[in-house]
């Protein structure tokens, strides 16, 4: 089989026939050096998954539940291409499983026990697997058989396709539990009708069901959605209030050597030639000899799944939790109101050591998880491997786009009521050596630059955003002659000045000596012309405050700030000479962990925060001798956010807009993956 062949897996005679037609029609339109199709027939989707894992086939299209199976070891497959529905302008690759209730009913998600439930059908995704999977650990024991546990949880249900003889309560609201449209409460519309008629208190459907059944907004306003955080939202806010976000139909391939670029090239060309309304003789999204053969008949086209996206991220935390609960059937010993330990994400070994010390001192209230980059940490928090970390504003933006929420903000100024008063922010500045007297904001081209890291606020987003507005392109590595911006591509001129050894060169963690505020300032001291840092960096590392050999003899007076008007000012005049105000660093977590992270961190700062006077003999949460490990070293306390509890509200409109503009220049693979899930 030539190298550019994609071996498509078919699961029936009809699929194999369509696959052969697909193969032949592709041959007729694609040059001989282009991608081609070969067909492999297997008895089932699970056999196809195994065949791809064993390198006997390359691709197959799967529903969400099977994407989960495909991801599990030893298969280790990943999503590579998604089918989309709707229009090319507004492509829908996901649907949302929701819990719909009547507006006046007054109960929340955690009060569903004893209510009457309407389901689309037993074993179906939005109507059964997701809600029951998420409620699984609240079901009465024994939880097997599952139908019995569900019957004992709700006071009555309509779950079409259930066995009405063995589990009569599941058919109480729709006698007989008929498994077709003959049952008026079957399917999405049926489950909604069950709620609408007053038979049930809650309907588990998908987000579009309400809109398809109620054209009139005034009618829709009689209903609400139950959110997982035990609040309610209007039905059109399903993106912020759902049980799970579910991919509709996805092509999977091997994680390693999986031909993902070739598969995309093939399918992209296929949709050009044989997509919706393209060709009479062969149609990719049509099944004359059956239904949904190879691809869904309702699909409109394909979108490439970003390479950073593994199956866990693609399926989302809620969906994976629901399906894992159903499959594995494991729950904590007894559900308690006690918070589980918070799994803190630590970057590289320096932060891990501090985190371990915190863990020991917290007596297990804190556990530690390691990752090599901030983005890897954010991904671990998203998928539940970790729970929380403190982030610079630039990463609060990425985390927010990935569905995480800020919970507490670092405060840097001593005040009587520190924990109750989140600050307005700190200043992003450009520092130069006083001796380089001709250097101004207007003649930085060709100079050597020092940055905290790519994607961070003071070190990147603010200065590069301002620069972008001036030069109108993203080739910052051409603007500066060389520099150190940890997280840049290793062959970039913006890694040339970095000092990390071997693989650690230019890494966005403390293994790179020029990483972070202190690192960027050190870069200026030793090699650079300008450093982009925070207003406190120079005083914190001069006058003997940093005992490291490179810093111990530095004098604040030997450095100046560049002002945007082309002038320069002494370091202490940052309030009148800065690039922008930056939002303080903040702790982020998943929505489901928000309350516990808040509670445990407030306890921890009372034990190990700024009130600890002797850090040589005691653990201090906000100290690491200028290394800013886990938290900035100048943190005085972690403050409540009050109503600034989303990333947009926390960062502020101006900063969100600035980072949004810089998105054109973003190299963040995680941001790309997260905006695929939520454009």
């Amino acid at each position: 089989v030539p190298d550019k062949t994609v071996r498509w897996c078919a699961v029936s005679e009809h699929e194999a026939t369509k696959c052969q037609s697909f193969r032949d029609h592709m041959k007729s339109v694609i040059p001989s050096d282009g991608p081609s199709v070969a067909c492999v027939k297997k008895a089932s989707y699970l056999d196809c998954i195994r065949a791809i894992a064993a390198n006997e086939a390359d691709a197959v299209t799967l529903d969400a539940g099977l994407v989960y199976d495909a991801y599990l070891a030893p298969n280790n497959l990943k999503p590579v291409v998604a089918e989309f529905y709707g229009s090319k302008e507004d492509p829908q690759t996901f649907y949302y499983a929701v819990a719909v209730v009547k507006k006046d009913s007054g109960f929340q998600m955690n009060q569903l026990r004893g209510k009457k439930s309407c389901h689309t059908g037993l074993g179906r995704s939005a109507g059964w697997n997701i809600p029951i999977g998420l409620l699984y650990c609240d079901l009465p024991e024994p939880r097997k058989p599952l139908e019995k546990a569900v019957a004992n949880f709700f006071s009555g249900s309509c779950a079409p396709c259930a066995d009405g003889t063995d589990f009569p309560q599941l058919c109480q609201l729709c006698p007989g539990c008929g498994c077709s449209t003959l049952n008026q409460y079957f399917g999405y519309s049926g489950a909604f009708k069950c709620l609408k008629d007053g038979a049930g208190d809650v309907a588990f459907v998908k987000h579009s069901t309400i809109f398809e059944n109620l054209a009139n907004k005034a009618d829709r306003d009689q209903y609400e959605l139950l959110c997982l955080d035990n609040t309610r939202k209007p039905v059109d806010e399903y993106k912020d209030c759902h049980l799970a976000q579910v991919p509709s139909h996805t092509v999977v391939a091997r994680s390693m050597g999986g031909k993902e670029d070739l598969i995309w090239e093939l399918l992209n060309q296929a949709q050009e030639h044989f997509g919706k309304d393209k060709s009479k003789e062969f149609q990719l999204f049509s099944s004359p000899h059956g239904k949904d053969l190879l691809f869904k008949d309702s699909a409109h086209g394909f979108l490439k799944v970003p390479p950073r996206m593994d199956a866990k991220m693609y399926l989302g935390y809620e969906y994976v939790t629901a399906i894992r609960n159903l499959r594995e059937g494991t729950c904590p010993e007894a559900p308690t109101d006690e918070c589980k330990p918070v799994k803190w994400c630590a970057l590289s070994h320096h932060e891990r050591l501090k985190c371990d010390e915190w863990s020991v001192n917290s007596v297990g209230k804190i556990e530690c998880v390691s990752a090599e980059t901030t983005e890897d940490c954010i991904a671990k928090i998203m998928n539940g491997e970790a729970d929380a970390m403190s982030l610079d504003g630039g990463f609060v933006y990425i985390a927010g786009k990935c569905g995480l929420v800020p919970v507490l903000a670092e405060n840097y100024n001593k005040s009587d009521n520190c924990e109750d008063t989140p600050e307005a922010g700190y200043f992003a500045i450009a520092v130069v050596k006083k001796s380089a007297s001709d250097l101004t904001w207007d003649n930085l081209k060709g100079k050597k630059s020092c940055h905290t890291a790519v994607g961070r606020t003071a070190g990147w987003n603010i200065p590069m955003g301002l620069l972008y507005n001036k030069i109108n392109h993203c080739r910052f590595d051409e603007f500066f002659s060389e520099g150190c911006a940890p997280g840049s591509k290793k062959d970039s001129s913006l890694c040339k000045l970095c000092m990390g050894s071997g693989l650690n060169l230019c890494e966005p963690n403390n293994k790179e000596g020029y990483y972070g505020y202190t690192g960027a300032f050190r870069c200026l001291v030793e090699k650079g012309d300008v450093a982009f840092v925070k207003h406190q960096t120079v005083p914190q590392n001069t006058g003997g405050k940093n005992p490291d050999p490179w810093a111990k003899n530095l004098n604040e007076k030997d450095y100046e700030l560049l002002c945007l008007d082309g002038t320069r000012k002494p370091v202490e005049e940052y309030a009148n000479c800065h690039l922008a105000r930056a939002p303080n660093h903040a702790v982020v977590t998943r929505k489901d962990k928000e309350a516990c992270v808040h509670k445990i961190l407030r306890q921890q700062q009372h034990l190990f925060g700024s009130n600890v006077t002797d850090c040589s003999g005691n653990f201090c949460l906000f100290r690491s001798e200028t290394k800013d490990l886990l938290f900035r070293d100048d943190t005085v306390c972690l403050a409540k956010l009050h109503d600034r509890n989303t990333y947009e509200k926390y960062l502020g409109e101006e900063y969100v807009k600035a980072v949004g503009n810089l998105r054109k220049c973003s190299t963040s693979s995680l941001l790309e993956a997260c905006t695929f899930r939520r454009p």
């Epitope: 320096h350 050591l353 501090k354 010390e357 020991v360 040589s616 003999g617 005691n618 653990f619």
Partner: nanobody, 117 residues
Framework: QVKLEESGGGLVQPGGSLTLSCAAS????????MAWYRQAPGKQRELVAG???????NYAGSVKGRFTISRDNAKNTVYLQMNSLKPEDTAVYYC???????????WGQGTQVTVSS
Amino acid sequence: QVKLEESGGGLVQPGGSLTLSCAASGSIFSINTMAWYRQAPGKQRELVAGITRSGTTNYAGSVKGRFTISRDNAKNTVYLQMNSLKPEDTAVYYCTDYSRKYYEDQWGQGTQVTVSS
């Protein structure tokens, strides 16, 4: 600077016991939390157990109930009593005092523990 020296490792059969010791010398007034780590071949170094100056202890889930960490402040020594040893406990065991405030990796030689029949 605090200097740490680990000892007490060896070869032991599954189910057996060992006690590791770590003696500290130097500017020990600054020692607060002490901990035992281990590193198996090809694996990351991981925290096994820790103890604060006041004697508060914490353990990795995999050793809870089998290992006990203790310290003798008068002798500036921390111990790790390891019972019901399993083959997966095989590793080089290191102790650390965290007084270096997480600067570079400054680990001692460690002591090898091998659990095998």
